[in-house]
Amino acid sequence: VPRWRQQWSGPGTTKRFPETVLARCVKYTEIHPEMRHVDCQSVWDAFKGAFISKHPCNITEEDYQPLMKLGTQTVPCNKILLWSRIKDLAHQFTQVQRDMFTLEDTLLGYLADDLTWCGEFNTSKINYQSCPDWRKDCSNNPVSVFWKTVSRRFAEAACDVVHVMLNGSRSKIFDKNSTFGSVEVHNLQPEKVQTLEAWVIHGGREDSRDLCQDPTIKELESIISKRNIQFSCKNIYRPDKFLQCVKNPEDSSCTSEI
């Protein structure tokens, strides 16, 4: 007789999740010599321990604390790039501008990027059928709590000028309900962070509007200013050219506005 299993609204754990996390850890430690001391089996055990045998709607930041300790890493606090709804371009940027870091350029972010995971209460099984959806089921699920935890700590670590890449093609360029809007913005430390600089990425070829005047950007400016952090904003009209100029800044065409 098949055992009854809770049916959640979200997709189940990514197939081959344990193997993927372990392989990513090994790859990361090979690419980053300063992390070669990391024991990837211990990392996987700590990751697994955060959600296995626990109700997937009752996960806490504390559950991830053993993993956080193993993911200890140096991140230059003045080289942090946050992003919202424009992950691919942010990652392309840090792949070229190697001294800047998104959360997914850290070990912990790299391990979990684009993955889904959850377990079941009182069993050691991973649930590959379904996992809780943040809206339809519960917010304290393994994936949401993980990203809230690491995003908060990443923002807390930032200093000096912090950059954020925002998607100018969306109706809400700044979305208060995004991870950036609900977690990172509120955990920047005013005594450490002087300025938040927003880069609004344009989608259309002929889009010459000043999206820094968008009402949601003004809302972001208001939130940031109330926290005693300065705010600045730049339009990135041509993201393709922007990336090209990051690669080749001496190119003559890179002196004009991008």
């Epitope: 956080m68 140096t74 700590r153 670590a157």
Partner: nanobody, 117 residues
């Protein structure tokens, strides 16, 4: 600007003790959790211990639990690490940093602890 200055390191025999200090400035010290992290020669960064702003919450790495004690004096903006029963594997440069990690950007030069007979 956050600034820290670590001191108190030195050469000590196995089983010996040291007390590290970290003088902090440029921020409201009592508002911030603080941590000690260390880097052994040729190794990566290892988290050692953290303490909340009020000192109500304290945590240690398993490798130092029972031997090291973290404390703070908010009136003097100073963080401490009392290290007892030192072992050769505790040899490292010790840094203090704001926050509880896992992401650290230590601002000080660190203080070298060498445990050797």
């Amino acid at each position: 600007e956050v600034q820290v200055l670590e001191s108190g390191g030195g050469l000590v025999q196995p089983g010996g003790s040291l007390r590290l200090s970290c003088a902090a400035s440029g921020f409201t010290f009592s508002n911030y959790a603080m941590s000690w992290v260390r880097q052994a020669p040729g190794k990566g960064l290892e988290w050692v211990s953290s303490i909340s702003g009020s000192a109500g919450s304290i945590d240690y790495a398993d490798s130092v639990r029972g031997r090291f004690t973290i404390s703070r004096d908010n009136s003097n903006n100073t963080l401490y690490l009392q290290m007892n029963s030192l072992r050769a594997e505790d040899t490292a440069v010790y840094y203090c940093a704001d926050g509880t990690g896992p992401f650290f950007d230590y601002r000080g030069q660190g203080t070298l602890v060498t445990v050797s007979s």
